[in-house]
């Protein structure tokens, strides 16, 4: 009985009512694989989803998100509001990145700036909401002796920063 | 925009041959079984075979089997119907249509009379 | 194979008015597809999978049935609705049309 269903291809099911014979998939359904016994329904990408490929008999539908909306999740089983640059996604709606952290994408949370101090650097580039602070050389190396492209940065507290 | 165009048919002898082509558009023919189905003049409609989208199952409607053979090139997003031994009875216009059944040609008519 | 009958073969009907056509099968089936077709066009996809109205397809139109008994309904009839009707079982080969109904506006 195996045997004769594992001869029905992609796009077919395996109908053991009617002596193992292989029927087309009926509309708007899929089988990926061989064997099969029943055909998938078709995903439908509907309201927030996009469609990015097309479903057929052998294959599933594929979705995005439409603009404003990112995809989360395995073959973008969700779709997650964007937020700016500067921001991240709360409960509550898209809210402004605390002081002392950033973040330079339309998803994803706020993270810490750098310290630089922690390797040992001192703060070339303030960080903002949406840019994390760029490192300089340590101090060490802007003693008067040495040679430098760039002036020293101000003397403050690494990763401090004017909002 | 998904379409199917037949080509193909024409007058044919009583015994004659003819092969009839389907050329598909707007979609992923390799990805599609696809049918043959027929119609003639002022009749029903008449299902005449089945071709999986790798061309691994092949089925044909008992009146065509042994007479007709049904391919595929997938390369090319074209289908076949090599008809040959055609009778009176197979004049008809000739429809391609996808496993589904959703999207049918614009049909092609053969015509078998001397 | 299975023999699908359409019943009527020739009806019609007044604007509003609702319509019913049945496809009875010789033998059980899984499910059947209903086609919709005018003079000189390719037949078009009207029904699938029994009950599931295939796109653009207006809503007055349903489908229903199980095993051998399936109808098409159109809740109120229109003008445009005119057109013959087929059935097609495919659940088993080879597949198999019904013989068609055509439906006419009185």
């Known amino acids: 009985l195996q045997d004769l269903c594992s001869n029905c291809p992609a796009g077919t099911f395996c109908d053991n009512n009617r002596s193992q014979i292989c029927s087309p998939c009926p509309p708007n359904s899929f089988s990926s694989a061989g064997g099969q016994r029943t055909c998938d329904i078709c995903r439908q990408c509907k309201g927030v989803f996009k469609t990015r490929k097309e479903c057929s008999s052998t294959s599933n539908a594929e979705c995005d998100c439409i603009s404003g909306y990112h995809c989360l999740g395995a073959e973008c089983s969700m779709c997650e509001q964007d937020c700016k640059q500067g921001q991240e996604l709360t409960k509550k709606g898209c809210k402004d990145c605390c002081f002392g952290t950033f973040n330079d994408q339309k998803r994803g949370i706020c993270r810490p700036w750098t310290n630089c101090s922690l390797d040992g650097k001192s703060v070339l580039v303030n960080g903002t909401k949406e840019r994390d602070v760029v490192c300089g050389p340590s101090p060490a190396d802007l003693s008067p002796g040495a040679s430098s492209a760039t002036p020293p940065a101000p003397a403050r507290e690494p990763g401090h920063s004017p909002q | 925009d998904v379409q199917l165009v037949e080509s193909g048919g024409d007058l044919v002898q009583p015994g004659g041959s003819r092969k009839l082509s389907c050329a598909a558009s707007?979609?992923?023919?390799?990805?599609?079984?696809m049918h043959w189905v027929r119609q003639a003049p002022e009749r029903g409609l008449e299902w005449v075979a089945y071709?999986?989208?790798?061309?691994?199952?092949?089925y044909y409607a008992d009146t065509v089997k042994g007479r007709f053979i049904i391919s595929r090139d997938n390369p090319k997003n074209t289908l076949f119907l090599q008809m040959t031994s055609l009778r009176s009875e197979d004049t008809a216009m000739y429809y391609c249509?996808?496993?589904?059944?959703?999207?049918w040609g614009q049909g092609t008519s053969v015509t078998v009379s001397s | 194979q299975i023999v699908l009958t359409q019943s009527p073969a020739i009806m019609s009907a007044s604007p509003g008015e609702k319509v019913t056509i049945t496809c009875s099968a010789s033998?059980?089936?899984?499910?059947i597809h209903w086609f919709q077709q005018k003079p000189g066009t390719s037949p078009k996809l009207w029904i699938y999978?029994?009950?599931n109205l295939a796109s653009g397809v207006p809503a007055r139109f349903s489908g229903r049935g199980s095993g051998t008994s399936y109808s098409l309904t159109i809740s109120r009839m229109e003008a445009e609705d005119a057109a013959t009707y087929y059935c097609?079982?495919?659940?088993?080969?080879?597949?198999?049309f019904g013989g068609g109904t055509k439906l006419e506006i009185k």
């Open positions: 071709i999986s989208s790798g061309s691994s199952t092949i």
């Open positions: 999978s029994t009950s």
């Open positions: 097609l079982q495919g659940s088993s080969y080879p597949w198999t």
């Open positions: 033998s059980s089936v899984n499910y």
């Open positions: 249509a996808r496993d589904w059944v959703d999207y």
């Open positions: 707007g979609f992923t023919f390799s990805s599609f079984g």
